[in-house]
């Protein structure tokens, strides 16, 4: 906390600028007004200030605004941001998408934060749903960010948001959440043709039921052995020898180095062995 | 790059248990969840359990009633309580966050 101290002679910041570097911490408490710098803030990030003073800025808005600072000046916080803790965030009420990209860049590079996931969750409760323009701003600064949601907060994805999904998003979602995601996948997806259509659904097919990848295997689709390793056991089991060889097409040989794991492990003995002698892979039911 | 560092596994007999820890590296905030994988000797890898951004869980059906999965913010940690080990849960276990994954700890049943 920085003792109340009058301001020296002529030493009264009339802006913000490259001089107030050199005052000391009493003096950039005493002469540099509250809501200059809050009018100012866009500048603050071009100075070369130390932690310190940093600190000493960051009191005066928290004085100005002790319920929390506006968004005008949120979106020029700059490096000040690092400087917030959780509970100065949650106080914000931040609505600008804008706003939210300024401070995500000034963190970039960093990890998640405290502060960030702070920020994060209090823009997407003020949007109320998680559209398309925050997913694609949240994935391109965290891809994982998709599957950190629980299938509950994922049920409350729009279907058009998912055209922001990017296969690498779905990196780590688990088989629960992509039971939530792939029903909004085929959603969203469903006026494309079926070529471009398995393109893009392809990477939500974990969470796929048997009906749809008997509907794929009439396609041509040629689905290769890392999409059909992912795929849920239970909508593989149903399939018959003939829908998994037109499922993967010349992909089919595959089957045979992924013979003791799953889905195929299990597949292959729910097959009768003549069924599968058709393949001629050698497979042992 | 968010680092990730996996502990806790070790040799048990089969009914014992075990507890693995994730730990996230700086000022990492394990608020936005984190997973454990995985990977037995000559298998694909497969999810075990979750834990969300919004606390709740979620475990593959086999290990659900046997393991559970909680996290500590104040350190930055995710844990993996497992009990009553069958020889077919050995594997070397990953933890993975926001699309970073650790190294692994390996976790040996015996009988």
């Known amino acids: 906390e920085v003792e109340k101290t009058a301001c020296p002679s002529g030493k009264k910041a009339p802006e913000i600028d490259e001089s107030l570097i050199f005052y000391k911490k009493w003096e950039l408490e005493a002469c540099v007004d509250a809501a200059l710098l809050a009018t100012q803030m866009d500048r603050v990030n071009a100075i070369p200030f130390t932690y310190e003073q940093l600190d000493v800025l960051k009191h005066k808005l928290d004085e100005l605004y002790p319920q929390g600072y506006p968004e005008s000046v949120i979106q020029h916080l700059g490096y000040l941001f690092l400087k917030m803790s959780p509970e100065d965030i949650r106080k914000w009420n931040v609505t600008s998408l804008e706003t939210l990209k300024a401070l995500l860049e000034v963190n970039k590079g960093h990890e998640m934060s405290p502060q960030v996931a702070t920020l994060i969750d209090r823009f997407v409760k003020g949007r109320g749903q998680l559209d398309k323009d925050t997913l694609d701003t949240l994935t391109a600064f965290y891809p994982g960010y998709l599957c950190s949601l629980s299938p509950e907060e994922l049920s409350s994805v729009p279907p058009s948001s998912i055209w922001a999904v990017r296969p690498q998003d779905l990196d780590t979602c688990d088989p629960r959440q992509l039971d939530v995601l792939y029903p909004k996948a085929r959603l969203a997806f469903q006026n494309m043709n079926g070529s471009e259509y398995f393109v893009k659904i392809q990477s939500f097919l974990g969470g796929a039921p048997t009906e749809d990848l008997k509907a794929l295997s009439q396609q041509n689709v040629s689905m290769d052995l890392a999409t059909f390793m992912k795929l849920r056991t239970d909508a593989v089991l149903p399939l018959t020898v003939a829908e998994v060889q037109k499922l993967l097409g010349p992909h089919v040989e595959g089957l045979k180095a992924e013979e003791r794991h799953r889905p195929v492990r299990d597949w292959i003995l729910r097959q009768r062995q003549d069924d599968l002698d058709t393949l001629g892979l050698g497979l042992q039911g | 790059q968010l680092q990730l560092v996996e502990s806790g596994g070790g040799l048990v007999q089969a009914g014992g248990s075990l507890r693995l820890s994730c730990t996230a590296s700086?000022?990492?905030?394990?608020?936005?969840?984190a997973k454990w994988f995985r990977r037995a000797p000559g298998k694909e890898r497969e999810w075990v359990a979750s834990v969300y951004r919004d606390g709740t869980t979620g475990y593959d059906d086999s290990v659900k009633g046997r393991f559970t999965i909680s996290r500590d913010l104040a350190k930055n940690t995710v844990y993996l309580q497992m009990n009553s080990l069958r020889l077919e849960d050995t594997a070397v276990y990953y933890c993975?966050?926001?699309?970073?994954w650790g190294q692994g700890t390996q976790v040996t049943v015996s009988s």
């Open positions: 993975t966050a926001l699309n970073s």
């Open positions: 700086g000022s990492t905030s394990m608020s936005y969840g």
